[in-house]
């Protein structure tokens, strides 16, 4: 298997919101979980968007996860991963 | 490293309200993270009660919504538990422990403070 | 609210055997599961996260697994040191809800 390189980013929504997102690229199998956690549980489905799983072109594969939040409360936020048995989470990037 | 200690009174009477500290050194609770209190009835039942976090916004268990308040006092690093109109039921030993927000698991607790609920 | 079922309610066995703690949860927690040891008048210590994840400083002969509702802890070659009681808890949600517990005795 390959694991997958994960980069949050964030971006301006509307005032006082940001979106966030959590995107998995260069992996293989195509099988992932790529989702949000707020304060340390899972985050509704419903506030989250989520990317189709596509070859990037060089037989692994990329995605995404999204969910749009209150500036200021990043730090309540962490993207969580997990592909082939292995798993990791990651932050929201200080403004 | 950090490290949390639980106190106060080891007896309430039936209707008081119960008010226990949790000191933490070593860490400000203001920087990150989650800090709870659990209680662990007699029979070994583990219940997590709530929590207030490093930005002092609070979460309660629902079924003791109307009796609990988690609040801190940051100039101490210290946060408090308060349970009003106990009961016999409220006899458990008491436990503040920490998350982070990778995941709400327990890597940090106190030892106990056994409160018995006695007329 | 998710309640988390626990088996068996003790269980006793010899140094050197294999046991398995099982959890079941009242609904999907997606790997949001931990796991915890605790002994006679001490704090629940942690073992495992989101699973699988043996925490820092927790011996290989512990190993979790599962998916879905079903997990399960499992002690591999059992030591003196293993005796106490083990609960499961998950994260999925609030409120989070523990196991009501195993205790493991040693024969």
């Known amino acids: 298997s390959v694991p997958p390189m994960v980069n949050v980013t964030r971006s301006e929504a509307s005032e006082g919101n940001i979106t966030v997102t959590c995107r998995a690229s260069s992996f293989y199998p195509r099988n992932i979980t790529l989702t949000w956690r707020q304060d340390g549980v899972s985050l509704s489905h419903d506030t989250q968007q989520w990317g189709d799983v596509l070859p990037d072109g060089n037989g692994t594969y990329q995605t995404w996860v999204a969910t749009r939040i209150c500036q200021g409360e990043e730090q309540r936020f962490t993207c969580y991963m997990e592909h082939s048995g292995n798993h990791s989470t990651h932050p929201v990037p200080s403004g | 490293d950090v490290q949390l200690q639980g106190s106060g009174p080891g007896l309430v009477k039936p209707s008081q309200s119960l008010s226990l500290t949790c000191s933490v050194t070593?860490?400000?609770?203001?920087?990150?993270y989650y800090w709870n209190w659990i209680r662990q009835f007699p029979g070994n039942k583990l219940e997590w009660m709530?929590?207030?976090?490093?930005?002092?916004?609070?979460n309660y268990n629902p079924s003791l919504k109307n009796r609990i308040s988690i609040t801190r006092d940051t100039s101490k690093n210290q946060f408090f538990l308060k349970l009003s109109s106990v009961t016999t039921e409220d006899t458990a030993t008491y436990y503040c422990?920490?998350?982070d927000g990778r995941g709400a698991w327990f890597a940090y607790w106190a030892q106990g403070t056994l409160v018995t609920v006695s007329a | 609210d998710i309640q988390m079922t626990q088996s068996p309610a003790s269980l006793s066995a010899s140094v050197g055997e294999t046991v398995t703690i099982t959890c079941r949860a009242s609904?999907?927690?997606?790997?949001?599961l931990a796991w915890y040891q605790q002994k006679q008048g001490k704090s629940p210590q942690l073992l495992v996260y989101?699973?699988?994840t043996l925490a820092d400083g927790v011996p290989s002969r512990f190993s979790g697994s599962g998916s879905g509702t079903q997990y399960s802890l499992k002690i591999n070659s059992l030591q003196p040191e293993d005796f106490g009681n083990y609960y499961c808890?998950?994260?999925?949600?609030?409120?989070?809800?523990f196991g009501a517990g195993t205790k493991v005795e040693i024969k």
């Open positions: 422990a920490r998350y």
């Open positions: 070593g860490y400000s609770i203001t920087n990150d």
């Open positions: 709530g929590f207030i976090s490093f930005g002092g916004s609070n």
């Open positions: 609904g999907n927690i997606h790997n949001y």
């Open positions: 989101d699973a699988i």
């Open positions: 808890q998950h994260f999925w949600s609030f409120p989070l809800t």
